[in-house]
Interface confidence: low
């Protein structure tokens, strides 16, 4: 029987700069029941606080709700693992909420074959930003990426859409069924998961009108 191994805070993510969650990996348990606690203080403060919510983020997590989240302050946190034989501490992690944002996937992905008059047809892909993101405040710039492939193909074709919430794709294989997905990331932060796939059947006459 041994003291617990050193835990590691391996990930912190925020969906929208208003709340965030951190997760840790336990070290070895030393063969004994082990308790974990996360403590933190904000840069410039000396007062230590304990994690306000160990439940919302699931096992081995700490969730910081709105009232505990400030995008203007750096959080310095560590995890303490304790059993009957002793304690061990993770390394301190410095967390700036601005840099840990991982939005939800974009919403309302709509894909349609468009045929403007006397123009080559194209795939028009349109989506909405994730609900939790408030773009009106100007705190966020969301960037988008699209991927698509014929249903049976192995390779995805990737297109960077910048800040647009719609995108045109011209070169497609007639008669094929395509999968289309979109994801987003803030200017500083992480890519969201891909949105659920939308399927679109490309007509076999996907050619110029004239």
């Amino acid at each position: 029987q041994l003291p617990p191994g050193k835990p590691e805070i391996f990930k912190c993510r925020s969906p929208n700069k208003e709340t965030f969650t951190c997760w840790w990996r336990p070290g070895t348990d030393g063969g004994l029941p082990t308790n974990y606690s996360l403590t933190y203080h904000r840069e410039g403060e000396t007062l230590m606080h304990e994690c306000p919510d160990y439940i919302t983020g699931g096992p081995n997590s700490c969730h910081f709700g709105k009232q505990y989240t400030s995008m203007w302050r750096t959080y310095i946190m560590m995890v303490n693992a304790t059993n009957q034989m002793g304690s061990s501490f993770s390394d301190e992690l410095y967390v700036d909420v601005t840099y840990i944002v991982q939005p939800d996937p974009p919403l309302e992905l709509a894909v349609e074959v468009k045929q403007p008059e006397d123009r080559k047809p194209y795939l028009w892909i349109k989506w909405s930003p994730p609900t939790l993101i408030d773009l009106k405040t100007g705190w966020f710039t969301l960037l988008y990426e699209i991927r698509l492939k014929p249903e049976k193909a192995a390779e995805w074709e990737i297109h960077f859409a910048g800040q647009q919430t719609e995108f045109k794709i011209l070169s497609l294989h007639p008669g094929q069924k395509y999968l289309v997905q979109v994801r987003c990331k803030p200017d500083h932060g992480y890519w969201s998961a891909w949105s659920p796939a939308t399927f679109i059947q490309i007509p076999s006459d996907f050619t110029m009108n004239d």
């Epitope: 709509a110 349609e112 468009k114 008059e117 123009r119 028009w124 349109k126 009108n209 004239d210």
Partner: antibody
């Protein structure tokens, strides 16, 4: 046989609302764009709005933007035009039309008359 | 201002050839968008007469033909008949309006 049958027209006061319907039959409604086009008494044709097959995309003439809403119910094979804040200059026969491939209007209904007057 | 300009009226005698013009701009016909022509007989709904500049739907007699050049298009009717008396409209997509434009219409009278 392709058929488009408009309904819902009538007399309405300025500022009022009407909803026009266009019942389609004789073709796979969900495979086509659809349009509303109007014709004021003794005047020419004026395009009002169009809507894509799955309702993802809509376009409007500047004269009706913000007041009219085009929609469709593919399960009912029906096209709609919700007209709000109606003005005297909206008085016209309203036609629905089917948009074939490049959206050219290949079949038209017989029209329904909307009269806006106090 | 995006407009398609047509002569308000045209006329001819039976058997004659009549041409109706449709003049647009760089945001519609001149942009490369195709032109469609519609015929509206008195008291009826419009009917597609010519599509994609010069194509005839099935059932339209070959007396009707269309052409396009630059920012203009024209509809020609040869071997004019009394039943051709109608209003004729050109239409094209307009890029700046992101919508359809109809010409003002030409009333054709068969004398």
């Amino acid at each position: 046989e392709v058929q488009l049958l408009e309904s819902g027209g009538g007399l309405v006061q300025p500022g009022g609302s009407l909803r026009l319907s266009c019942a389609a039959s004789g073709f796979t409604f969900s495979s086509y764009w659809n349009h509303w086009v109007r014709q004021a008494p003794g005047k020419g044709l004026e395009w009002v709005s169009d809507i894509s097959r799955a309702s993802s995309y809509t376009n409007y003439a500047d004269s009706v933007k913000g007041r009219f809403t085009i929609s469709r119910d593919n399960s009912k094979n029906t096209l709609y035009l919700q007209m709000n804040s109606l003005r005297a200059e909206d008085t016209a026969v309203y036609y629905c039309a089917r948009g074939l491939d490049a959206r050219r209007m290949d079949y038209w209904g017989q029209g329904t008359l909307v009269t806006v007057t106090s | 201002q995006s407009v398609l300009t047509q002569p308000p009226s045209a006329s001819g005698t039976p058997g004659q050839r009549v041409t109706i013009s449709c003049t647009g701009s760089s945001s519609n016909i001149g942009y490369g968008y195709v032109v469609h022509w519609y015929q509206q007989l008195p008291g009826t709904a419009p009917k597609l007469l010519i599509y994609r500049n010069n194509q005839r739907p099935s059932g339209v007699p070959d007396r009707f033909s269309g052409s396009k050049s630059g920012t203009s298009a024209s509809l020609a009717i040869s071997g004019l008949r009394s039943e051709d008396e109608a209003d004729y409209y050109c239409a094209a997509w307009d890029d700046s309006l992101n919508g359809w434009l109809f010409g003002g219409g030409t009333k054709l009278t068969v004398l």
